[in-house]
């Protein structure tokens, strides 16, 4: 007959499981419940995946692992506190008098409920890693945390290599025994202990759950340390950098922590499991019943099979681990789960030229000398596209790519960004906004949606801001509709006339050269170099200024570079920036200084691209530690990450203009990194590549 095999992880749990099985059988609950003994939750998950057991209750972290690695699904959830339903919230608490925010946690003193505990460790550490605030090299989360905070109390961390830092704030019991124990001997253990660590001034932030402050303040019956505490003297840290009252935990938290849930194989009927357990809880969840599902007192332990605080079990509608965990918790787990034993010893970097091979070799040696992990290996390829193929084929792991290549890498090869480059603000040549500039003209004002029939000025055919982005954007928005992939003809028919300088004018529509003026003698009209006075971004703006065109597609710096006395050439000497405006995608016009909010797209910085199964946090963790040593172009550590002058090349491995490598944060896909506008423009152009 049909039976459900529950997996127990300890002798007391096996004992309780046997009693539950007997109680269910006696009550005639079907199907039969059997008990299988596993050695741990992880072992039980393996037994279930191998069809040697069927069900177990897991916490959030284990649900993540079981779902991601073994395809198990949650089917029944625990409910605790009626107000919060099947979850509670992990929060970061600070004293109201302090100035700490989520962005200023580096260097502050931290209080944790215990090592590897959900709200005290897993969520805050995972969140800090996932959001890019905390970089972890070589999966050594303990080292990263001990370097990040200015001392902590993490009960249970005494056995680790970093106990000096992670146990620095712990105090043990009144006689100094049990310092840093993961037990009540340590006064700063558990939720109330971590809060006490904050309240007594040992730490600056406590990672606890949403109810902790309210349960330990305002004269609740408490031990002496808490009797004078007021909840209003504490605040929560929100993820956006603000702070909130301790009652605002629904809006201001690090993550909603999902309740424990019963997981089974994907082919198991979740409804069947719920019906079995529902019958059980109907009969065996109230006091005085012969067997109590939600109590472990009789077995001398806590939380056996189910959490003792469970008030009821409920069916899970969307039976996927992602849906049950929720995106906040899921993200935190992504940041945390890094198994040093499964971390590849090498990160294979794709190189494209002899100078790049030389620089990469030096980088590998320099990193190895400083014991940076994983070690770099250099693998050559013929082109960026060849790199993408080799990364997809798992022959290489990483390469730095430009915007258009990032698009191809993501769309065609499924690669994702692991870290990005960041340039100095002055550096308008490496990351910039594409803008549509017009004269400020109240009587003949038009918007981006009304460009048909206007005269247009472009830097040149194929230039990113002058052609690719604006034309791609107009195609994507449905204004320009090429027939038979003939973009040139479509553009020439969309605008009344244009100047789009070009190098190879064969079969080039004449209207795309109609506004061009050539050199001072009227020769070299429409050529793709500076002999054409309307060539380049400066030339396209001049085309607008001299009233040849109605709109110029340029970089966000172009207007500033050629107005307010910044360009002394006669055509520009008297120009004022305030006489020009930008056309915005939403149909509005804006001041030229509003380029960040009113642009056709931002040309994105380069990014390091990897396979989606690569742990991006270890890649950024490596680069972040490396740039501390080698990122400054004047460092004395024997290698310069962001300088190629020693190799007679430019932009090798990284752009030389890079000031630092940055985490991707929420931009975890190629679309996220590139931005919707840039992607739309590229899609507009690529839709025409027949």
């Amino acid at each position: 007959g049909m039976e459900v095999r529950w997996c127990a992880t300890s002798d007391p749990e096996q004992h309780k499981c046997g009693n539950m099985s007997e109680a269910f059988r006696e009550a005639g609950i079907q199907p039969s419940l059997l008990c299988v003994r596993g050695t741990s939750a992880d072992h039980c998950v393996q037994l279930i995946a191998a069809q040697e057991a069927d069900a177990i209750t897991l916490d959030g972290g284990a649900i993540y692992e079981a779902g991601k690695e073994h395809g198990l699904k949650p089917v029944v959830g625990e409910v605790y506190d009626q107000e919060v339903g099947t979850s509670y919230y992990a929060v970061a608490v600070v004293r109201r008098s302090s100035h700490v925010t989520i962005d200023t946690l580096k260097g502050v003193k931290s209080c944790h409920t215990g090592i590897n505990r959900t709200v005290g460790w897993n969520v805050p550490v995972g969140y800090l890693v996932e959001s890019g605030r905390l970089s972890v090299m070589g999966c050594d989360v303990l080292k990263a945390v001990s370097d990040y905070f200015g001392g902590s109390c993490v009960p249970g961390a005494g056995e680790t290599s970093y106990s000096e830092s992670l146990c620095r704030l712990c105090r043990g019991d009144s006689s100094g025994e049990g310092v840093c124990d993961k037990s009540p001997l340590e006064r700063y253990y558990d939720y109330s202990g971590a809060f006490r660590c904050l309240a007594e001034g040992a730490g600056d932030v406590a990672f606890v759950k949403h109810s902790t402050v309210l349960e330990n303040t305002d004269g609740k019956t408490l031990p002496s340390w808490g009797q004078a505490l007021l909840s209003q003297d504490f605040e929560l840290l929100c993820r956006d950098g603000s702070r909130a009252d301790v009652t605002e935990w629904r809006q201001c938290h690090l993550a909603r922590v999902p309740a424990h849930a019963v997981v089974v194989r994907a082919d198991t009927d979740g409804g069947l499991i719920f019906r079995l357990l529902n019958e059980g809880q109907r009969l065996f969840s109230h006091e005085g019943s012969s067997f109590q599902m939600f109590s472990s007192e009789a077995y001398g332990q806590k939380d056996l099979l189910f959490k003792d605080s469970t008030s009821e079990l409920v069916p899970i509608a969307t039976q996927t681990y992602e849906a049950w965990l929720g995106h906040e918790y899921l993200h935190a787990m992504k940041g945390l789960l890094c198994d040093p034993n499964r971390l590849p010893p090498y990160l294979r970097w794709c190189v494209l030229s002899t100078p790049e091979i030389q620089k990469c070799g030096d980088m590998a040696v320099a990193f190895r000398r400083q014991r940076l992990k994983p070690e770099i290996q250099c693998v050559s390829a013929k082109s960026p596209q060849h790199c993408m193929e080799r990364i997809q084929a798992e022959q290489v792991d990483a390469v730095t790519l430009s915007g258009e290549d990032i698009y191809t890498a993501g769309k065609t090869y499924g690669l994702v960004p692991a870290a990005g480059e960041h340039y100095a603000p002055e550096d308008s040549s490496n990351s910039y906004y594409v803008v549509a500039v017009v004269r400020r003209d109240s009587s003949h004002a038009f918007t981006l949606d009304e460009l048909r029939g206007k005269r247009s000025c472009h830097a040149g055919f194929g230039s990113p801001a002058g052609w690719d982005v604006p034309v791609g954007a107009l195609i994507q928005r449905g204004f320009i509709r090429p027939k038979d992939c003939d973009v040139l003809t479509a553009v020439s028919e969309f605008f009344n006339a244009s100047c789009v300088p070009v190098n190879n004018p064969k079969n080039y529509p004449s209207s795309l050269c109609a506004l061009c003026v050539g050199d001072e003698q009227g020769r070299n009209k429409c050529v793709g170099n500076s002999q054409e006075r309307y060539y380049g971004y400066r030339g396209a703006f001049r085309c607008l200024v001299e009233n040849a065109g109605d709109v110029a597609f340029v970089r966000h710096t172009t207007v500033f570079d050629n107005t307010n006395g910044h360009n002394s050439e006669p055509w520009a000497a008297e120009l004022r920036s305030e006489d020009y405006e930008l056309l915005c995608p939403n149909g509005a016009r804006a001041e030229v200084s509003q380029f960040a909010a009113c642009n056709l797209a931002q040309i994105p910085p380069h990014a390091v691209m990897v396979r989606p199964d690569t742990n991006i946090f270890t890649v950024y963790g490596l680069l972040d530690k490396a740039q501390d040593l080698f990122g400054d172009d004047h460092n004395k550590n024997g290698f310069k990450m962001f300088d190629s002058s020693n190799y007679h090349g430019q932009d090798l491995l990284f752009k030389d203009a890079t000031v630092r490598a940055v985490p991707v944060g929420e931009k975890t896909t190629y679309r996220g990194w590139l931005g919707l506008d840039y992607v739309a423009a590229l899609e507009g152009m690529s839709s025409q590549q027949c």
């Epitope: 960041h422 100095a424 002055e426 308008s428 040549s429 570079d561 960040a596």
Partner: antibody
């Protein structure tokens, strides 16, 4: 009119953390680059770092291991934290803005706050 | 770092005189994008520095036209055509072509 105002303790003990706030009015810190500069006794100016409109930070490598610049956009404030201070960190600390309009020169400065590191 | 050297250290002038301050960079300040990010600031006694000139020769709004900047590559000059009492203070040049931005040591303009 853009105005920046530094605030924070004027005396910090050696090995402790120096924490300063820059409150901005007349402009939003979600636009442009927001900087910290310090001036030592004897007038020498040192650029410390910035936080950009998108939240990215850059730190002068000479301070990299000790400095943190953060912001709270809801308050239109940004912050400087300098850890493990010594007497050498005694200086007047300025916050300042950089935007494209002046090609990222520092066009508006706070009035400065003097910080002494001493036990 | 890129070293900015200002001369003279102190410049005594009479009101109405022309004053000239020199600033030399240890390497060229021409950025790969063609711009030269050399700026001048004035710090009056008891005040914070104020921007005078940006990108070599552009006067910031409200700066009188008696101030002018010139130069290229590594050598730059700030000129004050007719010194007035309100011009007294310490003048700093600064570059932001290379990171981190750096400042000159300052030139003190004082009454003779």
């Amino acid at each position: 009119e853009v105005q920046l105002q530094e605030s924070g303790p004027s005396l910090v003990k050696p090995s402790q953390t120096l924490s300063l706030t820059c409150s901005v009015t007349g402009d939003s810190i979600t636009s442009g680059y927001w900087n910290w500069i310090r001036q030592f006794p004897g007038n020498k100016l040192e650029y410390m770092g910035y936080i950009s409109d998108s939240g990215i930070t850059y730190y002068n490598p000479s301070l990299k291991s000790r400095i943190s610049i953060t912001r709270d956009t809801s308050k239109n404030q940004y912050y400087l934290q300098l850890n493990f201070v010594t007497a050498e960190d005694t200086a007047t600390y300025y916050c300042a803005r950089r935007t494209l309009a002046t090609y990222y020169a520092m066009d508006y400065w706070g009035q400065g706050t003097s910080v002494t590191v001493s036990s | 770092d890129f070293v900015m050297t200002q001369t003279p250290l102190s410049l005594p002038v009479s009101l109405g005189d022309q004053a000239s301050i020199s600033c030399r960079a240890s390497q060229s300040l021409v950025h790969s994008n063609g711009n030269t990010y050399l700026h001048w600031y004035l710090q009056k006694p008891g005040q914070s520095p104020k921007l005078l000139i940006y990108r070599v020769s552009n006067r910031f709004s409200g700066v009188p036209d008696r101030f002018s900047g010139s130069g290229s590559g590594t050598d730059f000059t700030l000129k004050i055509s007719r010194v007035e009492a309100e011009d007294l203070g310490v003048y700093f040049c600064s570059q932001s072509t290379h990171v981190p931005p750096t400042f000159g040591g300052g030139t003190k303009l004082e009454i003779k």
